[in-house]
């Protein structure tokens, strides 16, 4: 039961996280004009990964896309790439994790396959979250650098007569959305990986034929190992107390402690 809950919660947390990463990537407020001592401004500038906007106090808002690709800073391109990779990995992870969910029955999919898929989606969520956190952090670092540079040149005088106020930019809402979303995706991924351990069956049995020894009613079958998940090995000996040879497929399967749906 705990495994199903962990897996389900991991899926939901990752889903929220990836939705947040998508929202952050699309948001226009990655950087917003620093208002320092002036909370009311006649012209308010803010920028996203894809366009920059200006909101006047009149209520008029104008946004302009970055129609150039080569003219954009390499750092901005890198942030875009990280966020897109994060979204793509997260989306694939969600798709995989849907089929891996314990509460969803797809044909006769074995627990080992579900465990594999859970681990795969978990790793994808972790990488997706890390991409988002990295992207947002790179952008934040870029902002901090530019902020202090523009503070140093806050006013560029022309003969001491004319002053040009340089617009400084600070952290926008999208950065916080991105950090939180990335963190949630990361946590969801870790939860999926934890759920994977519990999902893996106690032993993965190979289709082995059991022959009973002539003198004893004991059949020896080599214990399988959890090669697919990589979590330890299981070398228990199983006794089959009926005579005759049977394939593993014919052996009655009883619910394990993890088989609650």
């Amino acid at each position: 039961m705990a495994v199903t809950a962990c897996q389900g919660l991991g899926f939901v947390v990752s889903l929220i996280g990836i939705a947040g990463i998508i929202a952050a990537t699309c948001m226009d407020q990655w950087s917003t004009q620093d208002l320092y001592n002036n909370p009311v401004t006649a012209v308010f500038n803010y920028q996203g990964l894809w366009r920059s906007c200006v909101r006047e106090s009149s209520g008029f808002t104008e946004c302009r896309g970055y129609f150039t690709l080569l003219g954009l800073p390499a750092m901005l391109q890198a942030v875009r790439a990280l966020m897109i990779v994060g979204i793509v990995l997260g989306a694939i992870g969600l798709l995989v994790s849907i089929f891996a969910l314990k509460c969803i029955r797809i044909g006769s999919m074995e627990d080992s396959a579900k465990a594999n898929m859970t681990l795969t989606s978990g790793i994808m969520f972790i990488v997706s979250g890390l991409c988002a956190i990295a992207g947002v952090s790179v952008f934040a670092n870029m902002l901090v650098t530019n902020f202090w540079m523009s503070t140093a040149n806050m006013y560029t005088g022309m003969g001491g007569m004319v002053q040009t106020v340089q617009t400084r930019y600070t952290f926008g809402a999208a950065l916080f959305v991105g950090w939180v979303a990335g963190g949630l995706t990361l946590i969801g991924g870790v939860m999926m990986c934890i759920a994977c351990r519990g999902l893996a069956p106690e032993e993965t049995n190979y289709k082995a034929v059991s022959y009973h020894a002539s003198g004893h009613s004991v059949a020896y079958k080599p214990g399988g190992f959890k090669a697919s998940t990589g979590f330890g090995s299981n070398t228990k000996n199983k006794k089959i107390y009926d005579g005759g040879a049977r394939t593993e497929d014919e052996v009655q399967s009883y619910p394990s402690k993890h088989d609650y749906v």
Epitope: Q33, N38, V40, T41, A42, V43, N45, Y46, Q47, S52, C53, V54, E56, S57, S58, G59, F60, E62, R64, V162, Q163, T164, V165, T167
Partner: antibody, heavy 118, light 113 residues
Framework: EVQLVQSGAEVKKPGASVKVSCKAS????????MHWVRQAPGQRLEWMGM????????NYNEKFKGRVTLTLDKSASTAYMELSSLRSEDTAVYYC???????????WGQGTTVTVSS | DIVLTQSPDSLAVSLGERATISCKSS????????????LTWYQQKPGQPPKLLIY???TRESGVPDRFSGSGSGTDFTLTISSLQAEDVAVYYC?????????FGQGTKLEIK
């Protein structure tokens, strides 16, 4: 047709207060900032402050802070400007004006003359 | 506060001639975000409130005759009346629409020569 109709002329004594009204019609009152600008005889136009009829938020020129109060009556689509502790230099024509694109004033009231005299 | 200085204080131009009014700002009115200059021009006739002519330094308000044009960027701006008409006699003001408090130039009185 957009119209801003202001109250009539006022004569006040120094130290008194004056309250000027500005009734808006012909547009959605709550959608535009209402600004107040004054013009003393032979002087340049002077921005006093603004109020948003929807949120009621205000912003004042530091020069008038503490003396000017902008209020609203949303149901009557009317904005008010009250100036206290009047001095002779407050003798001016007071205008209400609607803010539009470009942070410019596209419609103005006809003006209210306030005379401060002992 | 941004200080706007207009020149000349008064101007006499013959009918049909070009009139040019200058407005200088103590700070740049160019917004880097949209590359627009937040300077507005108004016309005020005696006993009337100001009338909006031009915003964003060069965008003509609807209904304003095309003989009125605005130009300039940063700190230096110009209002031009290409062919002066009798009804253009008025005082012209420039306004900083970029930062609060909004400020106005001292005005330029335009007369017919």
């Amino acid at each position: 047709e957009v119209q801003l109709v202001q109250s009539g002329a006022e004569v006040k004594k120094p130290g008194a207060s004056v309250k000027v009204s500005c009734k808006a019609s012909g547009y959605t009152f709550t959608s535009y900032w209402m600004h107040w600008v004054r013009q003393a005889p032979g002087q340049r136009l002077e921005w006093m402050g603004m109020i948003h009829p929807n949120s009621g938020s205000t912003n004042y020129n530091e020069k008038f802070k503490g003396r000017v109060t902008l209020t609203l009556d949303k149901s009557a689509s009317t904005a008010y400007m009250e100036l206290s502790s009047l001095r002779s230099e407050d003798t001016a024509v007071y205008y209400c004006a609607r803010l539009k694109t470009g942070n410019s004033f596209d419609y103005w009231g006809q003006g209210t003359t306030v005379t401060v005299s002992s | 506060d941004i200080v706007l200085t207009q020149s000349p204080d008064s101007l006499a131009v013959s009918l049909g001639e070009r009139a040019t009014i200058s407005c200088k700002s103590s700070q740049s009115l160019l917004n880097s975000g949209n590359q627009k200059n937040y300077l507005t021009w108004y016309q005020q006739k005696p006993g009337q409130p100001p009338k909006l002519l031009i915003y964003w330094a060069s965008t003509r308000e609807s209904g304003v005759p095309d003989r009125f044009s605005g130009s300039g960027s940063g700190t230096d701006f110009t209002l031009t009346i290409s062919s002066l008409q009798a009804e253009d006699v008025a005082v012209y003001y420039c306004q900083n629409a970029y930062t609060y408090p909004f400020t106005f130039g001292q005005g330029t009185k335009l007369e017919i020569k």
